[in-house]
Structures are given as structure tokens and as C-alpha cells.
Interface confidence: low
């Protein structure tokens, strides 16, 4: 018969013919011939392969380094890597979460929009008119300006995106 | 032809601290992974430190751990080894070898820069 | 860690002569096993790969064998290029470790 010049889903072809790919956790060692299937081992204690594949090496478990901030979010299998975050605190610089850096605090002025997760950093926002942060935070929103009215009181300093209103007591001469 | 060159080594007290660095061509060195091997005199190899291809993870030998770091600059096709706060026992031939990927043998080494650590 | 045991630490041959080199590792290893060269100061050279694959350009009278626990490496003639040190190496997990070393040398 010819020999096939294209071969099933989960095969390769070589030396004119079709090999079984080794399934995901395993890797070639060595390929099938007319006479003997292909031959697969599984990956070591520390590596996977995630896909049908004919490699002959497995890939190494990402390694979560602690002195990079990093931890184990997901301990790696024979089929999937490791997948890191951050230490409470930090978040990844990247989508493949390399390495952490602290995350980034709102400045006086500014409050959080969007707390920072392992993955992605805080958002801030400028407090609009009617709100402040006098602080420099990773968690406090902008809060709204005291109403000094609710409290019976009159606005004796005006706030800004910093400061708050300062509330005084009522003029009693004014009619 | 594959090439890789250790630079680097010399003499330093107890304490002290080297960058090594392995100047590496003839291959695309961002596809492999990149490790370091060491060989105390008349002794045998140990393995010191390895950084994959991928998300250029790392790994340390219990003995360097927190002391040395392994780093690449895949746009200057060159490795480092910072060490830091080095020991008598360090005292060694540092290799700079090649392994496939994420894998875990060497299948190119340098010709290897001596590192002693005396007072 | 996974210790590795090499036998004999040195061994004395002729050319010509076929050698058996021993490496027994620890605990299970599977097929991740590597053997090396190396000559007086010079840089290892890797022979074997995954216990039994020949590296490119390696003579096809080194051979390796061994799955689990223990292994071989194989030199079926010796030639007097031949006279060096060898050290296997376990590639299964982290940290990767090393035989002690066999020196082979003439007789």
C-alpha cells in the first residue's frame, strides 16, 4: 500500500508512516516502527506535558520562588504546570506572574476604585467634588463630605479632594 | 557551533560577594534552559542552579538557596549567578551549561571560571 | 533528595577491553538518568541521555541501559580516549544530583 502521507487526530507521521502522539503526561521515548507501537514514559515527580505531544523531554514545573513574592496558587500535575500568585500584599507583574510587586496605594486626594487582586493592582480615581481621602491608601475609597446640615451645623471651611468640610454651629443671630 | 563562556570568577573573602556571568552563541539562547554546575577541586560535580525557557523559572540547590540567584538577559544571550555572602564551600570550578527547553541534563557546557573564597 | 551511587569509584582496564559502569539511584527515577564525561580539566562531556539515547556525535560504543532504580552505562571497546571520568546525574526532580564518579584508567 502507499505509505500515508497524512495521519488521524493523535498521530504523526514519520518514516512513512503513523505514530500514536503520547498523551498528555507522558512524553516519547521512543517512535513506533512497523512492528512496535510508540513508546511513552510518564513525566517525572517535578514536570508535565499538557497536550498529545511527541517530545522527548518533559517541561519542568514553574517554580514559585518566595523571593520573588511568589506562592503556589495550584500545585502542578504530570499534565499541567504550577500556577503561582502573590503574597497578600503583592500582585503579579505579568500574566504569566514572573515575579510580584507591592501593590500600588491611592494618594491623598485619590481613592480606590478597584482593590488590587493577586493579578491585577489597585485602580485609583480622583475624588470627584463632594468627596475626599486624606490618606494614602490600598483600600480606602474616596468618602463623601460631612453634611453639616444632617448634624444641624453650618459649613464654617469649605471641603476639598483632600479635607474634609469643617462643620461649625449655626449663627443663632441670623432670622 | 555552540559556544559558552564563563566570566567572572576570582578570588574573595568569606562574606563577600561575585557575579559570574556565561556569554553564550551559536544557538537561540530564549528557547533553552540555562544552568549552572560547580566542581569543588578534586571533587565531583554538584548542580547549582537552573532557569528555564518559559517564565524563566528558577531553581536552587538547598546549599545556595537564599544566597545565590540565577538570572538571563535573553537580549544579551548571557546568564548570571550573583552570589552573595559566600562560604569557604564555595570555593569551586562554576560550569555554564546548556540543557533542551524545560529540560534537566546538560547537553553543552563552558570551559568552566574558578571560584576561590579565602581570607 | 534523590541520592545517587556509583560503582566502582575507580576501575582499571585495557584497550580494548568492554566496561560496565553501575549507577543505583535512591528512590525510583524512571528513565531520567544521564551519564557524563569529563577529563582532567576539562568540561563534562554528556554521553547518554534518558538512560539509553545516544548524544549526537557520541561513539556508538558507549550504551546505556536501566530503568527505576539502577543503571549501566556501557563502553563495549575501550579506546585509549576512553580513559576519563564518568558521573551519571538524575534528571527527575529538583535538585538534580550527581554520582560521585567512576575513574577509569589505563591498566
Known amino acids: 500500500p502507499e505509505p500515508p502521507t497524512a495521519c488521524r487526530e493523535k498521530q504523526y507521521l514519520i518514516n512513512s508512516q503513523c505514530c500514536s502522539l503520547c498523551q498528555p503526561g507522558q512524553k516519547l521515548v521512543s517512535d513506533c516502527t512497523e512492528f512496535t507501537e510508540t513508546e511513552c514514559l510518564p513525566c517525572g515527580e517535578s514536570e508535565f506535558l499538557d497536550t498529545w505531544n511527541r517530545e522527548t523531554h518533559c517541561h519542568q514545573h514553574k517554580y514559585c520562588d518566595p523571593n520573588l513574592g511568589l506562592r503556589v496558587q495550584q500545585k502542578g500535575t504530570s499534565e499541567t504546570d504550577t500556577i503561582c500568585t502573590c503574597e497578600e500584599g503583592w500582585h503579579c507583574t505579568s500574566e504569566a506572574c514572573e515575579s510580584c510587586v507591592l501593590h500600588r496605594s491611592c494618594s491623598p486626594g485619590f481613592g480606590v476604585k478597584q482593590i488590587a487582586t493577586g493579578v491585577s493592582d489597585t485602580i485609583c480615581e480622583p475624588c470627584p467634588v463632594g468627596f475626599f481621602s486624606n490618606v494614602s491608601s490600598a483600600f480606602e475609597k474616596c468618602h463623601p463630605w460631612t453634611s453639616c446640615e444632617t448634624k444641624d451645623l453650618v459649613v464654617q471651611q469649605a471641603g476639598t479632594n483632600k479635607t474634609d468640610v469643617v462643620c461649625g454651629p449655626q449663627d443663632r443671630l441670623r432670622a | 557551533e555552540v559556544q559558552l563562556l564563563e566570566s567572572g570568577g576570582g578570588l574573595v573573602q568569606p562574606g563577600g560577594s561575585l557575579r559570574l556571568s556565561c556569554a553564550a552563541s551559536g544557538f537561540t539562547f530564549s528557547s533553552y534552559a540555562m544552568s549552572w554546575v560547580r566542581q569543588a577541586p578534586g571533587k565531583g560535580l554538584e548542580w547549582v542552579s537552573s532557569?528555564?525557557?518559559?517564565?524563566?523559572?528558577?531553581s536552587y540547590a538547598d546549599s545556595v538557596k537564599g544566597r545565590f540567584t540565577i538570572s538571563r538577559d535573553n537580549s544579551k544571550n548571557t546568564l548570571y549567578l550573583q552570589m552573595n555572602s559566600l562560604r569557604a564551600e564555595d570555593t569551586a570550578v562554576y560550569y555554564c551549561?546548556?540543557?533542551?527547553?524545560?529540560?534537566?541534563?546538560?547537553?553543552?557546557w563552558g570551559q568552566g571560571t574558578l571560584v576561590t573564597v579565602s581570607s | 533528595d534523590i541520592q545517587m551511587t556509583q560503582s566502582p569509584s575507580s576501575l582499571s582496564a585495557s584497550v580494548g577491553d568492554r566496561v560496565t559502569i553501575t549507577c543505583r539511584a535512591s528512590q525510583s527515577i524512571s528513565s531520567y538518568l544521564n551519564w557524563y564525561q569529563q577529563k582532567p580539566g576539562k568540561a563534562p562531556k554528556l554521553l547518554i541521555y534518558?538512560?539509553?539515547s545516544l548524544q549526537s556525535g557520541v561513539p556508538s560504543r558507549f550504551s546505556g541501559s536501566g530503568s527505576g532504580t539502577d543503571f549501566t552505562l556501557t563502553i563495549s571497546s575501550l579506546q585509549p580516549e576512553d580513559f576519563a571520568t564518568y558521573y551519571c546525574q538524575q534528571s527527575y526532580s529538583t535538585p538534580y544530583t550527581f554520582g560521585q564518579g567512576t575513574k577509569l584508567e589505563i591498566k
Open positions: 534518558a538512560a539509553s
Open positions: 551549561a546548556r540543557g533542551p527547553a524545560y529540560s534537566s541534563f546538560f547537553d553543552y
Open positions: 532557569i528555564y525557557s518559559g517564565g524563566g523559572g528558577t
